[in-house]
């Protein structure tokens, strides 16, 4: 369905409000350092142009591609070279190379100030004074800090953000109403960003086939009653949506996502019995709800997998005729029977099955060769099961903070070259797997834990890719998407690491720590712990625990002192000396 004017087509499909919001997100995700006002100006210019094309699709430039229109607009920014350096060279290229160039310059860790939340009354005044600008600013600030945030989902977050202010700014206790809602949106937003980042990494680093395999496994678990052909159609459509969003084609992505939600709801009888409530909601809520919907019940009468995939004489014939279709069917059949497995485990099993068929279908007696293929699955299944059991026991014993500390030590010893802020951020997130997943029954633990760990380890991979500092991280991140977690789990202490010098400044603390939130105080202590391990990678758990206990006592003591600053100065020196002695520094 070719349109004379792509920009007019998308404007009409999406409506002015969503069109403007999505163009703002797109621009902020590309030019992450540009001021808000500059972006608003660019968006308004694009919107006015789109309206002329709606009025007359034959008007000048209306036939240009969205990449051409948007790229030309971005390249009008006067300070491009000063602000972005070599990214300005993108503007010398032609499409599609120019867009690829912009994509390559997206920064997962932009040098932007932390978002500080103003007082509730200040926020409510700003909201009432100019609601439109207030909400645009939210989109802009999130998009520039999360350049791969799933744009249609960000519209859903903005809708909830608006609803929170609309409700709470009229409440008797504004803060009690608003702050928990904003905390929830912040935490959900970070999780949503990280999940989408993995989808984009999967597509960009490992290709469409890898993403499709992931989607087959996940959708088959979620919709086990759907036929393989139905799942395949959904996978194809979902792949298109995410390819578009990850490629910066946000208008097409949002439009296609809406079409996919419409299709799913029109065909829910052949997809899942769990979609009814989702499909009664408005568009943004509907799409979000479908993406999060619980797994449908498994059909009761599913036959054994062995018949079609091991015992049949036609295995090699079926495999040879259409390899990816046959492997897709295997993955579909295995996944719909195993909602208790993680997606990455299902993909490892499919890869093992594929490798076995590649080898055996060329053998003298193929059936004899692949007859025991399912036996090879047992250790692959047991490895994550055992790991999750051990780590959930440790989490239950230690609690979240100390469990995070155990992971901080573990990962700093594995990859000590990684920057301290990255190690703290990643290990804290790894540690959250305990409270997120260990409360679940056995049947839900593995999909919760291992698929969450895949998302967190991808954060490490994308941050490390910007500035590679460790071959071990590069290897685990690039060799196999589905084996990243086992690869990191298998790493031992890095014996090639040259320990960092002891620097007393790193362990000097001031009274300002006393006014920090509990979370920020934890981060300070965890930063010190990482630095300790970098100085003394061979330190035992007991040594590190003793130093950290002394440190916690020191902070507590000085925060209660009348002259806090003097306490931190004098007691701090003693603590540093005692720690050096305890660790043999």
């Amino acid at each position: 369905d070719a349109h004379k004017s792509e920009v007019a087509h998308r404007f009409k499909d999406l409506g002015e409000e969503n069109f403007k919001a999505l163009v703002l997100i797109a621009f902020a995700q590309y030019l992450q350092q540009c001021p808000f006002e500059d972006h608003v100006k660019l968006v308004n210019e694009v919107t006015e142009f789109a309206k002329t094309c709606v009025a007359d699709e034959s008007a000048e430039n209306c036939d240009k591609s969205l990449h051409t229109l948007f790229g030309d607009k971005l390249c009008t920014v006067a300070t491009l070279r000063e602000t972005y350096g070599e990214m300005a060279d993108c503007c010398a290229k032609q499409e599609p190379e120019r867009n690829e160039c912009f994509l390559q310059h997206k920064d997962d860790n932009p040098n932007l100030p932390r978002l500080v939340r103003p007082e509730v009354d200040v926020m409510c005044t700003a909201f009432h004074d100019n609601e439109e600008t207030f909400l645009k600013k939210y989109l802009y600030e999130i998009a520039r800090r999360h350049p791969y945030f799933y744009a249609p989902e960000l519209l859903f977050f903005a809708k909830r953000y608006k609803a929170a202010f609309t409700e709470c700014c009229q409440a008797a206790d504004k803060a009690a109403c608003l702050l928990p809602k904003l905390d929830e949106l912040r935490d959900e937003g970070k999780a949503s960003s990280a999940k989408q980042r993995l989808k984009c990494a999967s597509l960009q680093k490992f290709g469409e086939r890898a993403f499709k395999a992931w989607a087959v496994a996940r959708l088959s678990q979620r919709f086990p009653k759907a036929e393989f052909a139905e799942v395949s159609k959904l996978v194809t459509d979902l792949t298109k949506v995410h390819t578009e969003c990850c490629h910066g084609d946000l208008l097409e992505c949002a439009d296609d996502r809406a079409d996919l939600a419409k299709y799913i709801c029109e065909n829910q009888d052949s997809i899942s019995s769990k979609l009814k409530e989702c499909c009664e909601k408005p568009l943004l809520e509907k799409s979000h709800c479908i993406a999060e919907v619980e797994n449908d019940e498994m059909p009761a009468d599913l036959p054994s997998l062995a018949a079609d995939f091991v015992e049949s004489k036609d295995v090699c014939k079926n495999y040879a005729e259409a390899k990816d279709v046959f492997l897709g069917m295997f993955l579909y059949e295995y996944a719909r029977r195993h909602p208790d497995y993680s997606v990455v485990l299902l993909l490892r099993l499919a890869k093992t099955y594929e490798t076995t068929l590649e080898k055996c279908c060329a053998a003298a007696d193929p059936h004899e060769c692949y007859a025991k293929v399912f036996d090879e699955f047992k250790p692959l299944v047991e490895e994550p099961q055992n790991l999750i059991k051990q780590n959930c026991e440790l989490f239950e014993q230690l609690g979240e903070y100390k469990f995070q500390n155990a992971l901080l030590v573990r990962y700093t010893k594995k990859v000590p070259q990684v920057s301290t802020p990255t190690l703290v951020e990643v290990s804290r997130n790894l540690g959250k797997v305990g409270s997120k997943c260990c409360k679940h029954p056995e049947a839900k633990r593995m999909p919760c834990a291992e698929d969450y760990l895949s998302v967190v380890l991808n954060q490490l991979c994308v941050l490390h890719e910007k500035t590679p500092v460790s071959d071990r991280v590069t290897k685990c991140c690039t060799e196999s998407l589905v084996n990243r977690r086992p690869c990191f789990s298998a790493l031992e202490v890095d014996e090639t690491y040259v320990p960092k010098e002891f620097n007393a400044e790193t362990f000097t603390f001031h009274a300002d720590i006393c006014t920090l939130s509990e979370k920020e105080r934890q981060i300070k202590k965890q930063t010190a712990l990482v630095e300790l391990v970098k100085h003394k990678p061979k330190a035992t758990k007991e040594q590190l625990k003793a130093v950290m206990d002394d440190f916690a006592a020191f902070v507590e003591k000085c925060c209660k002192a009348d002259d806090k600053e003097t306490c931190f100065a004098e007691e701090g020196k003693k603590l540093v000396a005692a720690s050096q002695a305890a660790l043999g520094l």
């Epitope: 070259q417 590679p468 590069t474 690491y497 320990p499 010098e501």
Partner: nanobody, 117 residues
Framework: QVQLVESGGGLVQPGGSLRLSCAAS????????MSWVRQAPAKGPERVSA????????IYADSVKGRFTISRDNAKNTLYLQMNSLKPEDTAVYYC??????????PGQGTQVTVSS
């Protein structure tokens, strides 16, 4: 933007000396251990030497022990490699990297060292 610019390479006779420099910018140089890595034609990268963030800890590949010395000047954001008693097998492109990576950390092209009579 991380930038690592290597210099000081050249053509030298066996037994001769060279001093390589690596000027760093775009990151907190003094916070990171650094490495010198070399890649000879048709061979994989080899980590020659590494130094801790403050400069007191060093390690060397067996093939260069006693001949090469790594050092750094954190005030100047510069890493050095003093190469003495050079051998033909030291011929390679030498580049500096952050941490223990053998992947070039920035757009630097490395510096060519050729040992030949």
């Amino acid at each position: 933007q991380v930038q690592l610019v290597e210099s000081g390479g050249g053509l030298v006779q066996p037994g001769g000396s060279l001093r390589l420099s690596c000027a760093a910018s775009g990151f907190t140089f003094g916070q990171f251990g650094m490495s010198w890595v070399r890649q000879a034609p048709a061979k994989g990268p080899e980590r020659v030497s590494a130094i801790s963030s403050g400069g007191s800890g060093t390690i060397y590949a067996d093939s260069v022990k006693g001949r090469f010395t790594i050092s750094r000047d954190n005030a100047k954001n510069t890493l050095y490699l003093q190469m003495n008693s050079l051998k033909p097998e030291d011929t390679a492109v030498y580049y500096c990297t952050i941490g223990s990576s053998t992947t070039p950390s920035g757009p630097g092209q490395g510096t060519q060292v050729t040992v030949s009579s």
